[in-house]
C-alpha cells in the first residue's frame, strides 16, 4: 500500500481513540490499551505517559486524552505538564545539589520550592527597615526617618494620592 | 517506504556519536519512530521511541540519561545522538517506523557502531 | 515486562509443522513477530497476535492472549529457516524474545 495522503483521505474519517490502520485498508481502528489519539485522522495512537516513582496519577489516561501525573508528597511538579518533580524543602531554605540548605543572611525563601531571594534593600526607596528580614520572610519596608514626625504613625505610611485609571491595590 | 541509516562508525569508550534516519515514500510527520540495535550474533533490543510530534519520548533503560533521541519533520529525518559511549553500544542500528499496534513495520538496512579502544 | 522464548533452536524437516512459543512475565495486549535472516533487516511478520504481515505465506499463523503466544507453521519449507523474534508492547514500552532459530533438516 501507498502510505502518504490522498486528496481524499479517508483517515481523516478516524474519530479520536482510534487510529488509521493502513494494513487493513485504512479502516479505523481502536487505539490499543495504554495508548490514545486525542484528534481524528491519526495514523498511530501515542503512549499513555505513565505516573511512576515520585510522579502520581492525577488524571487517568484514556483512549482519547494523554494521563496527567503529579509530585508525590514531599515534591513539587516543574515544566510544562509536570515533566519532572522537584524535591520541596522548607521555608527558609533552597534546594542545592547537595539537598536542601538554609539561606544565607540576607536572603530568604517564603515557599517550600524555589530558590533565596535578596532581602528588599529599603534605602533604594528611600524607607527604613520597619520588620528585620528572616530566612523565611523579606524585611518590611517602613516610611523614611524624615517622615516619622512626632505624633506620625510608624506603622502606616501615608496613602498615596490616587491616579486617573489607577484601581486602588 | 524507505529508511536509510547514517553515520555510524568506530568510537572509543566515553565518546559521542550522531546517528541519523533518513525517511522517504510515506508521510513521516504522521508516524512515531523507533531506535532498535542488534549486538554482533544477539537478539534485538529496543532503545528509544518518539511520537510524531516528539511529545511522548521513551528510552530504554540501558540508554536513558546518555542517549537522546529526536526528529525534524521538516526534513524527513530521525536522529539518536549517544553519549558516553560504552563496549555493550556496540551493534547494529536500524530505525523503524511505528505501526498503530506498536509494532515495527518498516526497518532501515541499519548502520553499524563499534566501541573499542 | 520480560519475554521468554522457546525454543532458541528448532529443528524441522519439509512438510513438518512447527510452533514456538512466547511467555510475557505480565499480560500483554498483542504480540508480534519478525523474521529475520543472516546480514539482513528483521521483516514485520506477524502482527497484533494474528494478523499477517503484507506477503507473509498463508502456512503462517499467529495466536493467544494474556501471558502465552505462538507462532506455527503449518507446513516448512526451506525458505523459513530464519530466526523469529516475539516483540510486546503494553504498559513498559518494547521488549522483544530472545529469538528461535528455526533450521531445516
Known amino acids: 500500500f501507498e502510505r502518504t495522503r490522498s486528496l481524499q483521505d479517508p483517515c481523516s474519517n478516524c474519530p479520536a481513540g482510534t487510529f488509521c490502520d493502513n494494513n487493513r485498508n485504512q479502516i479505523c481502528s481502536p487505539c490499543p490499551p495504554n495508548s490514545f489519539s486525542s484528534a481524528g485522522g491519526q495514523r498511530t495512537c501515542d503512549i499513555c505517559r505513565q505516573c511512576k516513582g515520585v510522579f502520581r496519577t492525577r488524571k487517568e489516561c484514556s483512549s482519547t486524552s494523554n494521563a496527567e501525573c503529579d509530585c508525590t508528597p514531599g515534591f513539587h511538579c516543574l515544566g510544562a505538564g509536570c515533566s519532572m518533580c522537584e524535591q520541596d524543602c522548607k521555608q527558609g531554605q533552597e534546594l542545592t545539589k547537595k539537598g536542601c540548605k538554609d539561606c544565607c543572611f540576607g536572603t530568604f525563601n517564603d515557599q517550600k520550592r524555589g530558590i533565596c531571594r535578596p532581602w528588599t534593600n529599603c534605602s533604594l526607596d528611600g524607607k527604613s527597615v520597619l520588620v528585620n528580614g528572616t530566612k523565611e520572610r523579606d524585611v518590611v519596608c517602613g516610611p523614611s526617618p524624615a517622615d516619622l514626625s512626632p505624633g506620625a504613625s510608624s506603622v502606616t505610611p501615608p496613602a498615596p494620592a490616587r491616579e486617573p485609571g489607577h484601581s486602588p491595590q | 517506504v524507505q529508511l536509510q541509516e547514517s553515520g555510524g562508525g568506530l568510537v572509543k569508550p566515553g565518546g559521542s556519536l550522531k546517528l541519523s534516519c533518513a525517511a522517504s515514500g510515506f508521510t513521516f510527520s504522521d508516524y512515531g519512530m523507533h531506535w532498535v540495535r542488534q549486538a554482533p550474533e544477539k537478539g534485538l533490543e529496543w532503545v528509544a521511541y518518539i511520537s510524531s510530534g516528539s511529545n511522548s519520548i521513551y528510552y530504554a533503560d540501558t540508554v536513558t540519561g546518555r542517549f537522546t533521541i529526536s526528529r525534524d519533520n521538516a526534513k524527513n529525518t530521525l536522529f539518536l545522538q549517544m553519549t558516553s559511549l560504552r563496549s555493550e553500544d556496540t551493534a547494529m542500528y536500524y530505525c523503524?517506523?511505528?505501526?498503530?499496534?506498536?509494532?515495527?513495520?518498516?526497518w532501515g538496512q541499519g548502520t553499524t557502531l563499534t566501541v573499542s579502544s | 515486562i520480560v519475554i521468554t522464548q522457546s525454543p532458541a533452536i528448532l529443528s524441522a524437516s519439509p512438510g513438518e509443522k512447527v510452533t514456538m512459543t512466547c511467555r510475557a512475565s505480565?499480560?500483554?495486549?498483542?504480540m508480534h513477530w519478525y523474521q529475520q535472516k543472516p546480514g539482513s533487516s528483521p521483516k514485520p511478520w506477524i502482527y497484533?497476535?494474528?494478523n499477517l504481515a503484507s506477503g507473509v505465506p498463508a502456512r503462517f499463523s499467529g495466536s493467544g492472549s494474556g501471558t502465552s503466544y505462538s507462532l506455527t507453521v503449518s507446513r516448512v519449507e526451506a525458505e523459513d529457516a530464519a530466526t523469529y523474534y516475539c516483540q510486546q508492547w503494553s504498559s513498559d514500552p518494547f521488549t522483544f524474545g530472545s529469538g528461535t532459530k528455526l533450521e531445516i533438516k
Open positions: 505480565s499480560s500483554v495486549s498483542y
Open positions: 523503524a517506523s511505528n505501526n498503530g499496534y506498536f509494532y515495527f513495520d518498516y
Open positions: 497484533a497476535t494474528s
